[in-house]
Amino acid sequence: NQDLPVIKCVLISHENNGSSAGKPSSYRMVRGSPEDLQCTPRRQSEGTVYEAATVEVAESGSITLQVQLATPGDLSCLWVFKHSSLGCQPHFDLQNRGIVSMAILNVTETQAGEYLLHIQSEAANYTVLFTVNVRDTQLYVLRRPYFRKMENQDALLCISEGVPEPTVEWVLCSSHRESCKEEGPAVVRKEEKVLHELFGTDIRCCARNALGRESTKLFTIDLNQAPQSTLPQLFLKVGEPLWIRCKAIHVNHGFGLTWELEDKALEEGSYFEMSTYSTNRTMIRILLAFVSSVGRNDTGYYTCSSSKHPSQSALVTILEKGFINATSSQEEYEIDPYEKFCFSVRFKAYPRIRCTWIFSQASFPCEQRGLEDGYSISKFCDHKNKPGEYIFYAENDDAQFTKMFTLNIRKKPQVLANASASQASCSSDGYPLPSWTWKKCSDKSPNCTEEIPEGVWNKKANRKVFGQWVSSSTLNMSEAGKGLLVKCCAYNSMGTSCETIFLNSPGPFPFIQDNIS
């Protein structure tokens, strides 16, 4: 009774998609960290079938199904979904485990069903069955929190709409010097909807439910901080609430703050001021401007002025719909095997994007960082110098964006030779694509330096696997050529590789391989 191969089935969920494994009733959100799908083997007449726990994914969500194999040696695989075969490219991780992945992006009802992965390894043949259920996103929602002013109070109410109903918390940081990282010592959390303390350095409201966590930061201009080198910009969509806070500290109470939009003072009732004394007896004032539902005419430069500080401005732009701006042109890179390299995309977007990097049916977490010029950047460095096509995919509520990258890894040629009754042929991989020379070895040329100018036919490369370019060159033999030693050489910028062939041989009979760097 043959031992069953050790395999692990894993679900990787991508930001805010509400996918989960297990019973349909227990929807969970796994943010980027792999979730074990508990593959259990069922022996069948046609071989072993491993069945993974059912995967639940919200419509428009993105997931990766992954199988990790501890079995050593070569393996080949094939994905089958609704009787269609899909490409499969296994790779090996640092622990030498075989990894097979299938990325399913932007899931729709048509992508629900059974995904079969057929695996052939040296040890055994077997099948892994994944069942993917898609649930209507109408049932599961998590909207980004927004702010409202409390009736008759100078306080902020945090509202988040969602199903199941989200829990709301305020995350406050009052430190200029210390870290405002979520788990840092300067951070205070308040699990309540109303906030009266509005003097902190950083104020954000976060909402959480089964779909994940969304946060909104209170946009702030601090008159005691030097202005940024580029004007801060705030994007909003028509109908969204605008909240913009101006904060200033002075040695005494003898100063005031005002908000202006395009040099016109804001109307009464669209702002409120609060002040307090700090521990060192200096006065902190804040002035909060708000519009409960913005329209196009709320666009413009909002300037906060103080009688004791230089004024500062922010540009508020009101949009009909969200956007993702980035250059979508395909990019191609060629690097040496030892070079360190990252793919990167600079973009401007509103609302914030959800993104993923994809390579060979596998998807990878996407980090993004807002730069000070209003752009954000996402970089992907974990490609392990594997040649191929890489995809950056981003989406928000209103827009989608895809950018393709090609990575080529320079590689020295490696020649394989073959001789038949009528011809000698050599093939080689390597990048850039190798060029060929054929040389004759004779009494006159014992070092095989005499070039063969005629009868050579070079075939254009074809790709076995992405990035593995294969080029071949064939020498047609005349009767006079029989009994000769010939040498074929493939060369590119990384080096040269040669094979010597005895032309009398009917079958494959290369007997010398030269590698010249």
């Epitope: 901080q225 940024q228 080198s229 040496d336 360190k340 807002g370 010029d373």
Partner: antibody, heavy 124, light 110 residues
Framework: EVQLLESGGGLVQPGGSLRLSCAAS????????MSWVRQAPGKGLEWVSA????????YYADSVKGRFTISRDNSKNTLYLQMNSLRAEDTAMYYC?????????????????WGQGTLVTVSS | NFMLTQPHSVSESPGKTVTISCTRS????????VQWYQQKPGQAPVLVVY???DRPSGIPERFSGSNSGNTATLTISRVEAGDEADYYC???????????FGGGTKLTVL
């Protein structure tokens, strides 16, 4: 072995000119952005200028803009800094440095290979 | 353009942990990828941390970096006499297309 070797430093009078060179070896020079960084005696590091791998993008510190010109010759694996209208405050050790990543957006990565520096003294 | 502020000097006994901070004069340093360099007297700088918290090959695990909110930090655990050097933080200012270095921190191992 990856190496950078600066040359061209020396003593020059205020208002004079000097051209620094940085010879690169052991890597695909055209794949990397390069920078010049200087350090005045007893002071900290100050970035001077940077250039993209193809030579198409150039960047300058405000203190040298209009006086210094960065360039590169990828066929010779060499980086240059042409320094005109030199001032006493330009006196420093000048290092050339390579970006950590090939084909990098400057927003990340830093500089992982540095030369040993060439000393520029501006004095009358 | 913003500046990066570092403490002028820090000192610690061998075997202890030392931290060096780097703060932006305006805006949040969290919008930058931060690099840290070590420079010993008479030598060129050496990159010890890049992209906030990654270490180049050959740099001991004792060197670690973090970046959150208002401050980036270089932490050196189990400090050794050989760690005595000047340390500089560095970021790219994408609004002015400039590299910016901090003023440097002299680490003395007591």
């Amino acid at each position: 072995e990856v190496q950078l070797l600066e040359s061209g430093g020396g003593l020059v009078q205020p208002g004079g000119s000097l051209r620094l060179s940085c010879a690169a070896s052991g890597f695909t020079f055209s794949s990397y952005a390069m920078s010049w960084v200087r350090q005045a005696p007893g002071k900290g590091l100050e970035w001077v200028s940077a250039i993209g791998g193809s030579g198409g993008s150039t960047y300058y510190a405000d203190s040298v803009k209009g006086r210094f010109t960065i360039s590169r010759d990828n066929s010779k694996n060499t980086l240059y800094l042409q320094m005109n209208s030199l001032r006493a405050e330009d006196t420093a050790m000048y290092y050339c440095a390579r970006d950590y990543y090939a084909f990098s957006d400057p927003a990340y990565g830093g500089m992982d290979v540095w030369g040993q520096g060439t000393l520029v003294t501006v004095s009358s | 353009n913003f500046m990066l502020t570092q403490p002028h000097s820090v000192s610690e006994s061998p075997g202890k942990t030392v931290t060096i901070s780097c703060t932006r004069s305006s805006g949040s340093i969290a919008s930058n990828y931060v690099q840290w360099y070590q420079q010993k007297p008479g030598q060129a700088p050496v990159l010890v941390v890049y992209d906030d918290s990654d270490r180049p090959s050959g740099i001991p695990e004792r060197f670690s970096g973090s970046n959150s909110g208002n401050t980036a930090t270089l932490t050196i655990s189990r400090v050794e006499a050989g760690d005595e050097a000047d340390y500089y933080c560095q970021v790219w200012d994408s609004s002015s297309d400039h590299w910016v270095f901090g003023g440097g921190t002299k680490l003395t191992v007591l």
